[in-house]
Interface confidence: low
């Protein structure tokens, strides 16, 4: 929540439209990896500000007479991790008045992401040839989940799912045997998280 | 030429109230964070409140509710209303701007000195 | 009782190398920059070294920062007798700026 202080002036948002907010190469990266956060307005602008709400680390400015400021993180570390924003300005707006500020964006800077759950459903004990369904869940959108089978070198299946978490169905005559996921970010550099636990399925 | 002029320091009784401004020239007083510092007789400095750009102000625990910082950009100006005083509350108070990247304060104020006694 | 810990004193004599110390933990120091602040007796702060181990334009480059894990240091080499001063380390963590209680260096002889 981004609450101006005072004398700081945030116009209607049909005044000075909000400008976008962008991650390269991802908004998910190991340590160390060089990120370019991209703020690009609906209109040349003069300034363009990147700050991180609810925080008091000071802000970065770009003085540029276009569209677009890139904001280079280099070698980024988990502490620079968070919530980021980005503003613009004209000089012709007079002091203090900046644009809106763009949606958020979450970037995340981690060697391993938070392991995931792996549930069946209805449940783990399923009738002779019954299908069943498996859902591996992480805490993240946007993922490659893969789904693993114990004694089977290769991965199962794979999904690519824009929430947070992906189904795999498994064949009611196959389905018996033990199980764990994970998930990973879908393009280089590539973030894996920790294995799930192990989740056994037997007939009943 | 960037300077930092702090005035609004003198004599108050306990439990009085005292309002300091620090006024700014040489930049674009808006676009920065202003934060307010404080010292006591022989002691170390101590961070008192900040302004951001965007957002709510930050304060130390020790000053929350007692102490507002404010800013006025059209007057290049930063305040801090100061409530409550107690003797402890003697210091030199700076105004110091910080830096566009890496949590540092670039530029201080000379400081103007509160006194709390009866 | 300041969060980042500072020697309260450190001393040496003109030329000598002398190094200044300043703990803190994981929510600070750990994740975040620190910077170092020189106070000379009856002046204002002044800004020694920004981001660990940047120096501003105008600070001589005997003074150098250094960070590894929770703890920053601060050199002086070439000691001269005008480097007789507090200096304070700082840092912040999410919801406050955090400053070490100081050192008094002493220029001996």
């Known amino acids: 929540d981004i609450t101006p202080s005072v004398a700081i002036i945030v116009p209607p948002a049909s005044y000075h439209p909000k400008p976008w907010l962008g991650a390269q190469p991802a908004t998910v990266v190991t340590p160390g990896v060089n990120v370019t956060l991209r703020c690009r307005a609906p209109q040349p602008a003069w300034r363009f500000g990147l700050f991180k709400p609810g925080e008091i680390a000071p802000l970065l400015f770009r003085d540029v007479s276009s569209e677009l400021a890139e904001f280079f993180l280099e070698e980024v570390t988990p502490a620079q991790g968070g919530s980021y924003r980005c503003c613009y300005r004209r000089p012709d707006w007079g002091p203090g008045v900046w644009s809106q500020p763009s949606d958020v964006l979450e970037l995340l800077v981690t060697e391993e992401l938070p392991r995931p759950s792996l549930v069946a459903l209805p449940g783990p004990v399923v009738g002779p040839g019954a299908n069943v369904s498996l859902r591996c869940a992480g805490r993240l959108r946007n993922m490659s989940f893969v789904l693993y089978r114990e004694g089977v070198a290769a991965p199962l299946q794979y999904r690519h799912s824009a929430q947070p978490w992906a189904d795999f169905t498994l064949l009611g005559a196959r389905a018996p045997g033990t199980y764990s996921c994970y998930y990973h970010t879908p393009s280089a550099p590539y973030v894996l998280s920790q294995r799930s636990e192990v989740l056994v399925i037997s007939w009943e | 030429e960037v300077q930092l002029l702090e005035s609004g320091g003198g004599l108050v009784q306990p439990g009085g109230s005292l309002r300091l401004s620090c006024a700014a020239s040489?930049?674009?007083?808006?676009?920065?964070?202003w934060t307010w510092v404080r010292q006591a007789p022989g002691k170390g400095l101590e961070w008192v409140s900040g302004?951001?750009?965007?957002?709510?102000?930050n304060y130390a625990q020790n000053f929350q509710g007692r102490f507002t910082i404010s800013r006025d950009n059209s007057k290049n100006t930063l305040y801090l209303q100061m409530n409550s005083l107690r003797a402890e509350d003697t210091a030199v108070y700076y105004c110091?701007?910080?830096?566009?990247?890496?949590?540092?304060?670039?530029?201080w104020g000379q400081g103007t000195l509160v006194t709390v006694s009866s | 009782q300041s969060v980042l810990t500072q020697p309260p004193s450190a001393s040496g004599t003109p030329g000598q190398r002398v190094t200044i110390s300043c703990s803190g933990s994981?929510?600070?120091?750990?994740?975040?920059?620190v910077s170092w602040y020189q106070q000379l007796p009856g002046t204002a702060p002044k800004l020694l070294i920004y981001?660990?181990?940047n120096r501003p334009s105008g600070v001589p480059n005997r003074f150098s920062g250094s960070k590894s894990g929770t703890s920053a240091s601060l050199a002086i080499s070439g000691l001269r007798s005008e480097d007789e001063a507090d200096y304070y380390c700082?840092?912040?963590?999410?919801?406050?700026?955090?400053f070490g209680g100081g050192t008094k260096l002493t220029v001996l002889g």
């Open positions: 110091a701007k910080a830096g566009f990247t890496g949590g540092h304060f670039d530029i």
């Open positions: 040489g930049f674009t007083f808006s676009d920065y964070y």
């Open positions: 302004s951001p750009v965007f957002g709510a102000a």
């Open positions: 994981s929510s600070n120091i750990g994740n975040n920059y």
């Open positions: 981001g660990n181990s």
């Open positions: 700082q840092s912040y963590d999410s919801s406050s700026w955090l």
